[in-house]
């Protein structure tokens, strides 16, 4: 039961995280005009990975896409790449994890296959989360650098009297969404990896003891009502040794707390 819960929770947390990464990537507010210690403007500028926008106090908003690839800063391209890789890996991870979920039965898929798929999706979620966190952090670092550069020459005097105000940009909402989403995806991935350990079959082979009764070839196997005819194919390494009421999920104990990244 604990494995199913851990796996299910990992899937849900990762799903929320990946939805957040997608949302952050699409959001326009990666950087927003810094309003602190600035003249009050009737125009508010904000920028995303794909377009820049201007919202006037009249309520009119105009957005312009970056219709160039070569003209964009390399850092911005890198951030775009990291976010897209994160989304792609996360989407594949979600697809794999759906089939790996213990609560979903697909044909005669073995537990070992489900364990492998759970581990694969977990690793994908971890890498996806790290890509998102890295992408957002690179962009944030870029903003901090530009912020202090523009602060150094915020007012560039022109002929003494006339001044040009340089627009400074600070962290937008998308950065926080990205950090949280990346963290959630990472946590979800870790949970999937933990769940994988519980799904993996044990190596020890518990041999059944056969009692031959006259006239019938019946193999009795301790472990509750798990008896079958001698022709059964129950030779796989299944944990049917325990006669207690516990399910196989409860055999292994797991840490109950996970550190948030």
């Amino acid at each position: 039961m604990a494995v199913t819960a851990c796996q299910g929770l990992g899937f849900v947390v990762s799903l929320i995280g990946i939805a957040g990464i997608i949302a952050a990537t699409c959001m326009d507010q990666w950087s927003t005009q810094d309003l602190y210690n600035n003249p009050v403007t009737a125009v508010f500028n904000y920028q995303g990975l794909w377009r820049s926008c201007v919202r006037e106090s009249s309520g009119f908003t105009e957005c312009r896409g970056y219709f160039t690839l070569l003209g964009l800063p390399a850092m911005l391209q890198a951030v775009r790449a990291l976010m897209i890789v994160g989304i792609v890996l996360g989407a594949i991870g979600l697809l794999v994890s759906i089939f790996a979920l213990k609560c979903i039965r697909i044909g005669s898929m073995e537990d070992s296959a489900k364990a492998n798929m759970t581990l694969t999706s977990g690793i994908m979620f971890i890498v996806s989360g790290l890509c998102a966190i890295a992408g957002v952090s690179v962009f944030a670092n870029m903003l901090v650098t530009n912020f202090w550069m523009s602060t150094a020459n915020m007012y560039t005097g022109m002929g003494g009297m006339v001044q040009t105000v340089q627009t400074r940009y600070t962290f937008g909402a998308a950065l926080f969404v990205g950090w949280v989403a990346g963290g959630l995806t990472l946590i979800g991935g870790v949970m999937m990896c933990i769940a994988c350990r519980g799904l993996a079959p044990e190596e020890t082979n518990y041999k059944a003891v056969s009692y031959h009764a006259s006239g019938h070839s019946v193999a009795y196997k301790p472990g509750g009502f798990k008896a079958s005819t001698g022709f059964g194919s129950n030779t796989k390494n299944k944990k049917i040794y325990d006669g207690g009421a516990r399910t196989e999920d409860e055999v292994q104990s797991y840490p109950s707390k996970h550190d948030y990244v």
């Epitope: 009050v40 403007t41 009737a42 006037e56 106090s57 309520g59 022109m158 627009t167």
Partner: antibody, heavy 118, light 113 residues
């Protein structure tokens, strides 16, 4: 057709109060930023105050800050200007205007006259 | 506050003449985000409320005759009337629409010669 009709002007003593109203029609009032602009007799235009749509941020000219309060009632499609501690220099025709692209004031009312005199 | 300086303060013009008036701001009205200048021109005829002519320094408002044109960037702006007509007699105001308070220039009065 866009219409802005001001009312509430009149003669008031210095230190007195007055509340101007502006009834808007012909456009989606709740989505528009609206402003008050005044013009003293024989003088130029002076921006007084602006209230934005949505969150309703308010902005005031330094000359009226702390004395005038702009507000809006989207349900009634109305804009208001509460004027307290009135001075002789507040005597003017007060125009209600709508903000447009570029923050330009594209529609103006006919104005309401405010006279502050003892 | 942003100071808007208009010149000349008044001008006598003959019909058909080309008119130019200037407006200077104490700070740049160019927004780096969209590369637009937040300067507006208005026309006010005697006894009437002002009328919007040009916004974003050079975009003509719908219904405004094409003889009116705006130009300039940053701090220096110009309103041009290509062929002055009798009905253009009015006071023309420029306005800073970038910084609060949204200041107006003192106006340029156009009279018929």
């Amino acid at each position: 057709e866009v219409q802005l009709v001001e009312s509430g002007g009149g003669l008031v003593k210095p230190g007195g109060s007055l509340r101007l109203s502006c009834a808007a029609s012909g456009f989606t009032f709740s989505n528009s930023a609206v402003s008050w602009v005044r013009q003293a007799p024989g003088k130029g235009l002076e921006w007084v105050s602006t209230i934005t749509s949505g969150v309703s941020y308010t902005y005031y000219a330094d000359s009226v800050k702390g004395r005038f309060t702009i507000s809006r009632d989207n349900a009634k499609n109305s804009l208001y200007l509460q004027m307290n501690s009135l001075r002789a220099e507040d005597t003017a025709v007060y125009y209600c205007t709508r903000q447009f692209k570029g923050n330009a004031l594209d529609y103006w009312g006919q104005g309401t006259s405010v006279t502050v005199s003892s | 506050d942003i100071v808007m300086t208009q010149s000349p303060s008044s001008l006598s013009v003959s019909p058909g003449e080309r008119v130019t008036m200037s407006c200077k701001s104490s700070q740049s009205l160019l927004n780096s985000g969209n590369q637009k200048n937040y300067l507006t021109w208005y026309q006010q005829k005697p006894g009437q409320p002002p009328k919007l002519l040009i916004y974003w320094a050079s975009t003509r408002e719908s219904g405004v005759p094409d003889r009116f044109s705006g130009s300039g960037s940053g701090t220096d702006f110009t309103l041009t009337i290509n062929s002055f007509q009798a009905e253009d007699v009015a006071v023309y105001y420029c306005q800073n629409d970038y910084f609060y308070p949204l200041t107006f220039g003192a106006g340029t009065k156009l009279e018929l010669k």
